[in-house]
Amino acid sequence: RAPRCRELPAQKWWHTGALYRIGDLQAFQGHGAGNLAGLKGRLDYLSSLKVKGLVLGPIHKNQKDDVAQTDLLQIDPNFGSKEDFDSLLQSAKKKSIRVILDLTPNYRGENSWFSTQVDTVATKVKDALEFWLQAGVDGFQVRDIENLKDASSFLAEWQNITKGFSEDRLLIAGTNSSDLQQILSLLESNKDLLLTSSYLSDSGSTGEHTKSLVTQYLNATGNRWCSWSLSQARLLTSFLPAQLLRLYQLMLFTLPGTPVFSYGDEIGLDAAALPGQPMEAPVMLWDESSFPDIPGAVSANMTVKGQSEDPGSLLSLFRRLSDQRSKERSLLHGDFHAFSAGPGLFSYIRHWDQNERFLVVLNFGDVGLSAGLQASDLPASASLPAKADLLLSTQPGREEGSPLELERLKLEPHEGLLLRFPYAA
C-alpha cells in the first residue's frame, strides 16, 4: 500500500512567496513622479516578479519630529489622495498582490517613535490600524522598534487588533538589531509576528558562518514562521558585493520562511554606482534615462529594461526563483535540513512528503570548490540520491535539466546550485 500523504499545513498568503518593499515612492518611480497613481501603473511589473505582497511607505503625513503634525490616517498629498490609495488597493487585489502599509510614525524625523510621547503615538497607531484595516489593507509594517519603549507589549496589542480583524492580516516589525537574543525576546510575546532584522547582514563572509547563523536562528525560533532579509529596509547591495547577489537571492528564496526584498534588489540596484543618490533610497533604474544626472553613468545591463531582455540577468534569476518558490510544495512549506559539504560551502535540503525535493549548494568563497556532501548528517526521511537534476545555477554555462553526480559536484567561485530529485520510498 502507498504511504499516507502528510497533511498540508495551513498556508497564509505571505507563506506563498516574497514581499517587495517600496519605502520611497518617489525614488521607486523616478522622473519627478512618485505618487500612488503612478505606482498603480507599476503593478504589472510587480506581477511579473511573482511577489505576493507590496510593503508600501510610509506615506502618511509626517512633519519631521512633530507629533501634532503627524497623522497616520491622512496620506501626504505629495503621494496622492485617499481615493488614489483605494484605487491602488483595488488594482492590486485584482492582480493578487497584497498591500502592507508601513505606519512607522516619525519616518522623516530623528526618532521614528517620538521617544517622549510614546503613549500618544501608540494610541495613534492603534487607531490607524483600525482605520486602514477597514480600508482594505492586508497588513502593516512598523520599523525601528528598538526605539519603541515596551515594544513587545505594544506589538502584542497591535497584533491582536490586526488578527482580531482577520487571521489573514499580517503585522511586520522591523529592527536594526542583529542580536539573536534581542530578536528572540521580541518574537517571544508575539506568536505570528513577522520580524525583519539585520541578523544576516554580516553573514557575507563565509559559507560556514552563514550556515551557523541560519541554523541557529531556525533552531531558536522552533516551528514558527520566519522572514529572511538582510535588513529591515535597505538594499542588498548595502551589505553585499555584486558577486554574491545571485547567491543570496537563491538562498533567500529557498530558506523556510518569507523572503523580503527592497525595490531594486531584483536588478542589483546599487546607490554607490549612482553619484549623489542616497544609500537608503536610490532612484530605481527602469531604463537608461532613469538617472539623467550624469550621462552614460547607467548602462542597459543595470536597468529593468536591459535585464528583462537578458535571460542570464539577475532580474531573470529573481523571476525564476520567485516562480519556483511560489509553486513547489517543498519550497513552500517543506522541511529544512542543513548538512556539511566542505569548507566555504553551505548546503541544505528542502523536502515535503512525496513531492519533488530540492538540494541547494552555495559556494561563498572566491575559489572553485568540490563539494563533499555529507549525507550521513541527514535523517532517513531526507536521504540524498546519487544524482540530481540541475534546475538552475547562479552562473551561466551549465546545462540546465542535466543530471549531476552528487559525489563529483564542483562549484565555481560564488556559485549557487539548485538541484531537484524525486521522492524515493
Epitope: 494610541t123 492603534k126 487607531d127 482605520f131 477597514q134
Partner: nanobody, 125 residues
Framework: QVQLVESGGGLVQAGGSLRLSCAAS????????MGWFRQAPGKEREFVAT????????YYADSLKGRFTISRDNAKNTVYLQMNSLKPEDTAVYFC??????????????????WGQGTQVTVSS
C-alpha cells in the same frame, strides 16, 4: 443595543456656524468608533468625519477639511460636529453613526452598525 440621538441642526446663513451633538446610550461608548455622515436631497449618503474611541485620531472628507471639526466627550457619551463657514451645498440631513466593532470608524457607511435618525441642516444664501 446602542441608541443615537442627534441634535443641533437648524437653519443658518451662509458663512455661519452650527454645532451638532450626538448622544449615545450604553456604558461602552468609549469603545466605539464614531462617525458623521450626511445626505443631501436626491443624493447618496456621504462620509463627513470619523473619530477614534479615545478621540486621539480624526479623519475628514477631503472637501470638508479645515471647516468641520469632530470631537467627543466620553464622560458624556457624546460626539460633536462643529461646522464653520457653512455653504449652501452643506445643506443635508446629518447622521451620527457608531461602529461597535472598531475603535476607528471608516469612510464607508457599511462598517457602522448603529445610526441616529438624523438632524436637518439648512444653509441659506
Amino acid at each position: 443595543q446602542v441608541q443615537l440621538v442627534e441634535s443641533g441642526g437648524g437653519l443658518v446663513q451662509a458663512g455661519g456656524s452650527l454645532r451638532l451633538s450626538c448622544a449615545a446610550s450604553g456604558r461602552t461608548f468609549s469603545r466605539y468608533g464614531m462617525g458623521w455622515f450626511r445626505q443631501a436631497p436626491g443624493k447618496e449618503r456621504e462620509f463627513v468625519a470619523t473619530i477614534s474611541c479615545s478621540g486621539t485620531s480624526t479623519y475628514y472628507a477631503d472637501s470638508l477639511k479645515g471647516r468641520f471639526t469632530i470631537s467627543r466627550d466620553n464622560a458624556k457619551n457624546t460626539v460633536y460636529l462643529q461646522m464653520n463657514s457653512l455653504k449652501p451645498e452643506d445643506t443635508a440631513v446629518y447622521f451620527c453613526a457608531a461602529d461597535t466593532r472598531h475603535c476607528m470608524g471608516y469612510t464607508k457607511d457599511g462598517g457602522y452598525a448603529y445610526w441616529g435618525q438624523g438632524t436637518q441642516v439648512t444653509v441659506s444664501s
